[in-house]
Structures are given as C-alpha cells and as structure tokens.
C-alpha cells in the first residue's frame, strides 16, 4: 500500500513539476524591468527565453522573437538547452512511469520490470529537475551579474548634461516557477526511486530440506519465497488510473532585439 502511494504521489508530483518546467520555459517573464530606485517609465520591459516584450501604459504589448540563433548570448543558449533537456527527459520519464505504475496492469509485466521502469523514470525526473534548477539558476546568475554591472554605470554621461538611463532587469516570475517546478520534479523523482525499492522482488532462496517424521514422509520445500509488499497479485478488482495533465501557457504573439548587457 505504502509503495503504491509513494509511486503514485511521485508520479503526480513529477507531472506537476514537468508541467511547471514547460510553463516556465514558455513564459516571457524570465527577467523584468527593475522599477526600484529608477525613474518611473510609461514603458515596461520584460524578457523570456524566446522573445522580449514591451508593455506600454497605453496597454499595448509588443513582443518580438529572437530570430537570430548565433547572435544570442551563449548563456541564454545554455539555459534554453538545459530547459529543453529537462522537458524531454521529464516527458520520457512520465511516459515510462505510466507503464511502471503498480495500479496499472499491462499484460503479464513482472514486478521486477515495473521496479526497473520506476527506477528509470525516477532517475529521469531527478535529472530533469536538476536541469530546470540549473537552467533557472544560470539565468538568475546572469541577471545578478548584469544588474550590478548596469548599476555601476547606470547613468552614462553623454555630453555633460544629457543622461541615458540604462534599463536594469531583475528576477521575473518564470524564475520562481522554474525553481519550484524543478524542485517538485526532483522530489517526485526521489519518491519514484524510493518506491522502486519496495517494488523490487527480493529473491530469497532456501535450500530444500527433508524432514523425516516417524510414520509419515512429508517433504517441505520452501523455495523462491517472495518478500511480500502487503498486496496480493489479484488484480481483478483493481481500477486503472491514467493520470494526465496539460498546461497551456497562452501568450499573445506580436511581431526586438535582445539586450543582455
């Protein structure tokens, strides 16, 4: 019972986590214009992994994709790669874990096969979560570095009196979504690995011993005794749960240049 619960919960937590990683990757608010200690502008800038957006006081929002691949900072490319790898591993992990769920019976799949699949999906979720956390952390580090660099020369003098205020960027909502989602995927993966231990059939072979009782000839051969998990193999009345969730991150698409200082 505890194993099934652990496995099921691990699956659900990972599912939520991966949905969060997908959402974070698609979100435009990875970095948002820093409003603190800055002149109040009638224009608000925010940037994602795929495009940068400008929201005016008028309510008009204009988003432009980064149509160049080679012109983008290597760090941004690395973050993109980490997030995509995280999503791909997570998706494969979900697929594997669906078949590994103890409450789902597929043909005559052995418990050992289910245990292996559970472990595989668990490891995939752990790596997926680590990829997301790493990606978000790299981006956050990039923001912090750029923030202090732009603070150091925030007011760049141009011909004495005239000043240009550099736009500083701070953490956007996507970073927090990514951290939480990565953490959830990681936790889900750990839970799957824990569940795997309980699913694994521990083969305890005892040598056949003959007991000769007077007047009776009875041979007891306790062999191939399986460690019980508290569940029988009777699946007649078991319900099949097929968990699936989709998140749609709706983004308004408009037809700039990406600015990483």
């Amino acid at each position: 019972m505890a194993v099934t619960a652990c496995q099921g919960l691990g699956f659900v937590v990972s599912l939520i986590g991966i949905a969060g990683i997908i959402a974070a990757t698609c979100m435009d608010q990875w970095s948002t214009q820093d409003l603190y200690n800055n002149p109040v502008t009638a224009v608000f800038n925010y940037q994602g992994l795929w495009r940068s957006c400008v929201r005016e006081s008028s309510g008009f929002t204009e988003c432009r994709g980064y149509f160049t691949l080679l012109g983008l900072p290597a760090m941004l490319q690395a973050v993109r790669a980490l997030m995509i790898v995280g999503i791909v591993l997570g998706a494969i992990g979900l697929l594997v874990s669906i078949f590994a769920l103890k409450c789902i019976r597929i043909g005559s799949m052995e418990d050992s096969a289910k245990a292996n699949m559970t472990l595989t999906s668990g490891i995939m979720f752990i790596v997926s979560g680590l990829c997301a956390i790493a990606g978000v952390s790299v981006f956050a580090n990039m923001l912090v570095t750029n923030f202090w660099m732009s603070t150091a020369n925030m007011y760049t003098g141009m011909g004495g009196m005239v000043q240009t205020v550099q736009t500083r960027y701070t953490f956007g909502a996507a970073l927090f979504v990514g951290w939480v989602a990565g953490g959830l995927t990681l936790i889900g993966g750990v839970m799957m690995c824990i569940a795997c231990r309980g699913l694994a059939p521990e083969e305890t072979n005892y040598k056949a011993v003959s007991y000769h009782a007077s007047g009776h000839s009875v041979a007891y051969k306790p062999g191939g005794f399986k460690a019980s998990t508290g569940f029988g193999s009777n699946t007649k009345n078991k319900k099949i749960y097929d968990g699936g969730a989709r998140t749609e991150d709706e983004v308004q698409s408009y037809p700039s240049k990406h600015d990483y200082v």
Partner: antibody, heavy 118, light 113 residues
Framework: QIQLVQSGSELKKPGASVKVSCKAS????????INWVRQAPGQGLEWMGW????????TYAEGFTGRFVLSWDTSVSTAYLQISSLKAEDTAVYFC???????????WGQGTLVTVSS | DIVMTQSPDSLAVSLGERATINCKSS????????????LTWYQQKPGQPPKLLIY???TRESGVPDRFSGSGSGTDFTLTISSLQAEDVAVYYC?????????FGGGTKVEIK
C-alpha cells in the same frame, strides 16, 4: 468615430471647487487611459496626470497632487477632473485626451475653460 | 522630471519652404526593449485642442500629410515640414512619452514670412 466631449466653461470664485467631465464614445472606455492636460492662457501644455479606467490606476504629475482628483464612471464612460480650493492660477483650459499605443494622445476633448476670479 | 527643450521659440518660413523644429530631452527616450524612441509631436492651432502628428519619433499618424516627418534618436529630435502650407501655421509641441510625468516642450510657433 472616437470622440471625447468635455463639459462647458466654468466661472468660479477662489476657494470653490469644480468638476470637469470628459465623456468618451466610439470605443471601449475601460480599454484606454484618459490623460488630463492644462493650458494656462498664452502658455504651453502641461501634463497633469492620467487614469486607467480598466485598472483604476492613477498617476499625477508633481504639481497636481492634493487639490486635484481624477475619477471615472464606467457606466457612463466618463472621466472626471475635480479641483478643490481653487486659486487664480488655476485659470486655464483643461483638456482630456485618450492614451493610445505608442503612449500617444490620439484623441482630445475640445477643452474646458475654468476661470477663477473673485 | 525630464526637461524637454524646444528650439527655436518661433519660426517664420516662406510658403513652400522647409521648416525645421528641434527638440532635446534631458534623458534618452530610447527604450532598449523595442528600440523605439518615445517622443511625440503635436500641432495646436488657436482655439483648438492639440492634434497628434508623429509618435515613436518618426511614425506619422494616419491622416497626417506626408510633408510632416520626424527624425532623431535618444535625446535629439527634429520635426520637419518639407513644404510649408498656410494651414500649417500653428504651435508645435514635442512630448516625452517615456518617463512620468509625460512632459511637453515649451512649444515652437510657426508663422509665414
């Protein structure tokens, strides 16, 4: 077509209050902000502040806090500018203007002359 | 506050001639996010409300004659009337549309010589 129609001229005594209205038509009132601009006789344009009827957000210019209050009524698609404790220097033409994308004032009211005189 | 300085204060130009009005802001009006300059030009005739001519420093509002053009970036901007017509006699204002408060320039009066 888009129209902003302002209330008529006002003659007020110092210390009194005045409420200028700006009725919008031809567009969804809550989708765009309304700005208020003051023009003293023979002077240039002075931005007073703006109100976003969709969010209720208001922003005032530094010299227009306290005695000046911006409000709106969505049911009648009207924005209001209320000035209390009127002074002689408040004598001016007050314009309302719609804030459109590009942060531009694309449509203007005809203006309301407020005269403060004893 | 952002200071918008217009020059000259007044300008007398012959009909059909070019009129050039300058506007300088105390801080850059260029937004790095979309590479747009948030500067707007208005025309005001006596007894009338201002009329929008140019936004984003160089984008002409629909219905505005093509003799009106805007240029410049950052802190220095120009409004040009390529061939002055009698109906162009008015006061022209530039406006910062980037920083609050959305300040206007002092205005430039265009007259016929």
């Amino acid at each position: 077509q888009i129209q902003l129609v302002q209330s008529g001229s006002e003659l007020k005594k110092p210390g009194a209050s005045v409420k200028v209205s700006c009725k919008a038509s031809g567009y969804t009132f809550t989708n765009y902000g309304i700005n208020w601009v003051r023009q003293a006789p023979g002077q240039g344009l002075e931005w007073m502040g703006w109100i976003n009827p969709g969010t209720g957000e208001t922003t005032y210019a530094e010299g227009f806090t306290g005695r000046f209050v911006l409000s709106w009524d969505t049911s009648v698609s009207t924005a209001y500018l209320q000035i209390s404790s009127l002074k002689a220097e408040d004598t001016a033409v007050y314009f309302c203007a719609r804030l459109y994308y590009g942060n531009r004032f694309d449509s203007w009211g005809q203006g309301t002359l407020v005269t403060v005189s004893s | 506050d952002i200071v918008m300085t217009q020059s000259p204060d007044s300008l007398a130009v012959s009909l059909g001639e070019r009129a050039t009005i300058n506007c300088k802001s105390s801080q850059s009006l260029l937004n790095s996010g979309n590479q747009r300059n948030y500067l707007t030009w208005y025309q005001q005739k006596p007894g009338q409300p201002p009329k929008l001519l140019i936004y984003w420093a160089s984008t002409r509002e629909s219905g505005v004659p093509d003799r009106f053009s805007g240029s410049g970036s950052g802190t220095d901007f120009t409004l040009t009337i390529s061939s002055l017509q009698a109906e162009d006699v008015a006061v022209y204002y530039c406006q910062n549309a980037y920083y609050y408060p959305l300040t206007f320039g002092g205005g430039t009066k265009v007259e016929i010589k």
